[in-house]
Amino acid sequence: VPAQVVLTPYKPEPGYECQISQEYYDRKAQMCCAKCPPGQYVKHFCNKTSDTVCADCEASMYTQVWNQFRTCLSCSSSCTTDQVEIRACTKQQNRVCACEAGRYCALKTHSGSCRQCMRLSKCGPGFGVASSRAPNGNVLCKACAPGTFSDTTSSTDVCRPHRICSILAIPGNASTDAVCAPESPTLSAIPRTLYVSQPEPTRSQPLDQEPGPSQTPSILTSLGSTPIIEQSTKGG
């Protein structure tokens, strides 16, 4: 459809309404009149012969939608010291603040900005940071599954795989890595200790769950911390 020519004010025919996206019905004038575009407000309402008169929002005020507001809305107050301004206050949009690194938003505004930031929770030894976040954006901790461990208290570290030994000295558990025995001179043909690459911490969309001591399926936690041992069958 070609671009429409604005022809407000006009009288809607019986049974019809004004075009709600950019027009409103003025009861006094009984006409469909133009709304004001984002960044403006109504200075004078329409009458039968003249259309709405719009004016720009003043500093620190905005309108984000086509509107028939008598005043613009006030922008939110400046971002706090633990926040970063990700969208400035303009005539057409409100200021948006986000939490700085290491913090999550504990209290959001209806416009998506953050009102209160909190320090991210830390996961202790035996627990790693889950790939998903809590609904509020805080870290979720999950018990390290068999074959993985975490020996730190951190808001970023994930459970890492135990190292794989040719000869195992001490099995790993949820909070400590496996310890490999030194190579025996008689078994020089056996490959050196193998280390499994450690994945980087990952972040994904929050799941509908709250932080708890364990977020792993019960079938895994019931297996205990039996290490995965790769023994060599090569001999002399």
Partner: antibody, heavy 120, light 112 residues
Framework: EVQLLESGGGLVQPGGSLRLSCAAS????????MSWVRQAPGKGLEWVST????????WYADSVKGRFTISRDNSKNTLYLQMNSLRAEDTAVYYC?????????????WGQGTLVTVSS | QSVLTQPPSASGTPGQRVTISCTGS?????????VHWYQQLPGTAPKLLIY???NRPSGVPDRFSGSKSGTSASLAISGLRSEDEADYYC???????????FGGGTKLTVLG
């Protein structure tokens, strides 16, 4: 393709009745207001009646008020005009037309028309 | 007599600009209702040419334009062509009659 097809016209005696139908296709019929417009031989267009999409509101020209009834069956995508107590001056080609639904309601789709002749 | 008054005829030569007027009253055009224009080529059904005073449906050449002021409206056709030879009707809602009204129609002739 958006289409309107009128039927039901013909020769009828003064005082008689006739029911015109308009079959709609190619669009969501219930979302649009519909009208009947007529044109007497060699004359201009004359609006007859309008009905909104739901069928709840109707309007009639003074010349047909009390004699003609506009109706619609949205399940059948069909518009009707029941014409009673017909007069010689009702002789015309009758068009059904769709009102475009959003931009100021001009009649953007028309049928080819059906001729109604009222004569003894 | 029609509620909306149009000149019965208008004419022009190819390439010329022709204007057709449509005069109403305070109960229709003057009340603020929009005006639509229809073109009816010989032996065919009418076709929406201009809606909402000045908007062209897709497919209508930009040679056709509409405007409205006070109680009257007008249709302008520039660069007149032989295929523009047709009857032209204006239409609007009328408060007094509580219904739609058409102008009497203007027969446009494209000369020689």
């Amino acid at each position: 393709e958006v289409q309107l097809l009128e039927s039901g016209g013909g020769l009828v005696q003064p005082g008689g009745s006739l029911r015109l139908s308009c079959a709609a296709s190619g669009f969501t019929f219930s979302s649009y207001a519909m009208s009947w417009v007529r044109q007497a031989p060699g004359k201009g267009l004359e609006w007859v009646s309008t009905i909104i999409g739901s069928g709840a509101n109707t309007w009639y020209a003074d010349s047909v008020k009390g004699r003609f009834t506009i109706s619609r069956d949205n399940s059948k995508n069909t518009l009707y005009l029941q014409m009673n107590s017909l007069r010689a001056e009702d002789t015309a080609v009758y068009y059904c037309a769709r009102h475009e639904g959003y931009y100021y309601y001009g009649m953007d789709v028309w049928g080819q028309g059906t001729l109604v002749t009222v004569s003894s | 007599q029609s509620v909306l008054t149009q000149p019965p005829s208008a004419s022009g030569t190819p390439g010329q600009r022709v204007t057709i007027s449509c005069t109403g009253s305070s109960s229709n055009i003057g009340a603020g209702y929009v005006v639509h224009w229809y073109q009816q080529l010989p032996g065919t059904a009418p076709k929406l040419l201009i809606y909402g005073n000045s908007n062209r449906p897709s497919g209508v050449p930009d040679r056709f334009s509409g405007s409205k002021s006070g109680t009257s409206a007008s249709l302008a056709i520039s660069g007149l062509r032989s295929e523009d030879e047709a009857d032209y009707y204006c239409a609007a809602w009328d408060d007094s009659l509580n219904g739609r009204v058409f102008g009497g129609g203007t027969k446009l002739t494209v000369l020689g």
